[in-house]
């Protein structure tokens, strides 16, 4: 190796100056004795370089670019060799962002997975590599003071989520949760969140189902839908409220809301509607009077309303 | 302090009759769903019913349905078990018990003996 | 129904040994498992809910695992107050299951 570059810094806040010295060693004999060393970033040549011949022989030329403009590109130092550019080293060089604040904590309990989901925004873009952490930790009481750390849980490249297992969780106590972004600038760390895992359960949707007739039962009146649910039954012991969405399959009707109802309610007849119409119902529920998150909405169940016109205009509950 | 005392349990005949209570106290009744689990002598412990916090929603065992009722009165705070057409397999130890968010029982009355003889 | 295997039936073991139970279930139940210590003559107690939640007041002595189908109670180091006998249950679905128990004995 004929020559060594050496940069003050190979990451910088893009725009930064940036200074790098090339140094060619005595003992390169085939080279000219006073050889110029020229300096390109990337495909473009770079005036403004210094060069002096240092004590021991080498020859060194230091360069100095005012703004590092781009997110990467590759610095060389090289001599002229007949009509062609010898390169004697490259470096490469990086410009970026320290990492912005990680925003938007948000975490919810699946109960399926038995795992804390956790998500976030990243911030702008850093044009760096940036490694994202969930860090956590165990705490009695309002998470003032800190019990067991909790392992770190690192998402895929690319992710803005991550999971921690049932394992290094706690039910019913609170758990610290930040996200902490580090890249070659810089660390940044969200706010914490401080939570019981089961004050963000989100829960699976009840099952719609059409009510099975009864002989004794009265058929549904005109304008009229006789529906029921079926629980996810892993949710059942949580106490839950829930709520209906329905729109006539036809046109461009938004969706009308009905509720809450208590999960318990497991049969409904929801009147009002327009008659010899078919409808799509949805259900969706949440955990309460405690805290939750709300279910997905159901899978969509589509009835049809009877034929006369409508009578009354009501929502009725059976228990 | 979370405290379940069952009541109501004796010696019956086959087919005869019992209402076993479950007095609540130290929680919010109203709010939890409520259970009870048996145990025969010298066996292991079998589930019975269940009961959702406004009596809306209640499962039994196989072995119960049809004969047994589970009900509860949530401005005396109690839970109750009506037992009819009593047969000599459900004699057993009976525990009212609390059922947790997802599904333990915790904490658990005393328990209290029903003996099905002739 | 979901059918809860427990084993062993019983086992003989020494103050300071470590005692594990296992409880297997028919189907996968997530983590909807939970474990109960009950001693001659009284009501039982709840040790460990959702797999692995040791229950407020429960020595730290013992730990649950396990999710699916597969699971473990562990006693790290056997007391003389731990002799009783164990039961695993389910929740995941009606009818909620007990195991078949496990009794402790003092070798």
């Known amino acids: 190796e004929c020559g060594h570059i050496s940069v003050s810094a190979p990451i910088v806040h893009l725009g930064d100056p940036i200074t790098a010295s090339c140094i060619i060693k005595q003992n390169c004999s085939h080279l000219d004795p006073e050889p110029q060393i020229l300096w390109r970033l990337g495909a473009e040549l770079q005036p403004g370089g210094r060069q002096q011949r240092l004590s021991d022989g080498t020859q060194e030329s230091i360069i100095t670019l005012p703004h590092l403009n781009h997110t990467q590109a590759f610095l060389s130092c090289a001599l002229n060799w007949g009509n062609s550019l010898q390169i004697l080293d490259q470096v490469e060089l990086r410009a970026g962002y320290p990492p912005a604040i990680p925003h938007n904590l948000s975490c919810l309990m699946n109960l399926t997975t038995s795992s804390l989901i956790c998500q976030w925004e990243p911030g702008p873009e850093t044009h760096l590599p940036t490694s994202f952490t969930l860090k956590s930790f165990k705490s009695r009481g309002n998470c003032q003071t800190q019990g067991d750390s909790i392992l770190d849980c690192v998402p895929k490249d690319g992710q803005s989520h991550c999971s921690i297992p049932r394992k290094h969780l706690l039910l019913y106590q609170n758990m610290g949760i930040w996200v902490q972004a580090e890249n070659a600038l810089g660390t940044s760390m969200s706010p914490q969140l401080c939570l019981d895992p089961m004050d963000v359960v989100k829960l699976e949707p009840p099952m719609l189902r059409t009510m099975d007739p009864s002989p004794e039962a009265a058929p549904p009146q005109a304008g009229c839908l006789q529906l029921s649910w079926e629980p996810w039954q892993p949710g059942l012991h949580i106490n839950q409220k829930c709520e209906l969405r329905h729109k006539p399959q036809r046109g461009e009707a938004s969706w009308a809301l009905v509720g809450p109802l208590p999960l318990e309610a497991l049969q409904y007849e929801l009147c009002g509607l327009l008659p010899a119409t078919a409808y799509t119902l949805q259900i969706r529920c949440i955990r309460w009077p405690l805290p939750g998150h709300w279910s997905d909405w159901s899978p969509s169940l589509e009835l049809r309303t009877t034929e006369r016109a409508p009578t009354h205009h009501h929502h009725h509950h059976h228990h | 302090e979370v405290q379940l005392l069952e009541s109501g349990g004796g010696l019956v005949q086959p087919g005869g009759s019992l209402r076993l209570s479950c007095a609540a106290s130290g929680f919010t009744f109203s709010l939890y769903w409520m259970g009870w689990v048996r145990q025969a002598p010298g066996k292991g412990l079998e589930w019975v019913s269940s009961i959702s916090s406004s009596g809306g929603v209640t499962p039994y065992a196989d072995s119960v349905k049809g004969r047994f009722t589970i009900s509860r009165d949530n401005s005396k705070n109690t839970l109750y078990l009506q037992m009819n057409s009593l047969r000599a397999e459900d004699t057993a130890v009976y525990y009212c018990?609390?059922?947790?968010?997802?599904?333990?029982?915790?904490?658990w009355g005393q328990g209290t003996l029903v003996t099905v003889s002739s | 129904d979901i059918q809860m295997t427990q084993s062993p039936s019983s086992l003989s073991a020494s103050v300071g040994d470590r005692v594990t139970i296992t409880c297997r279930a028919s189907q996968g139940i997530s983590s909807y498992l939970n474990w109960y210590q009950q001693k001659p003559g009284k009501a039982p107690k709840l040790l460990i809910y959702y797999a692995s939640n040791l229950q407020n007041g429960v020595p730290s002595r013992f730990s649950g695992s396990g999710s699916g189908t597969d699971f473990t109670l562990t006693i790290s180091s056997l007391q003389p107050e731990d002799f009783a006998t164990y039961y695993c249950q389910v929740s995941w679905e009606y009818p909620l299951t007990f195991g078949g128990g496990t009794k402790v004995e003092i070798k």
């Open positions: 018990a609390k059922l947790g968010e997802l599904g333990w029982f915790d904490p």
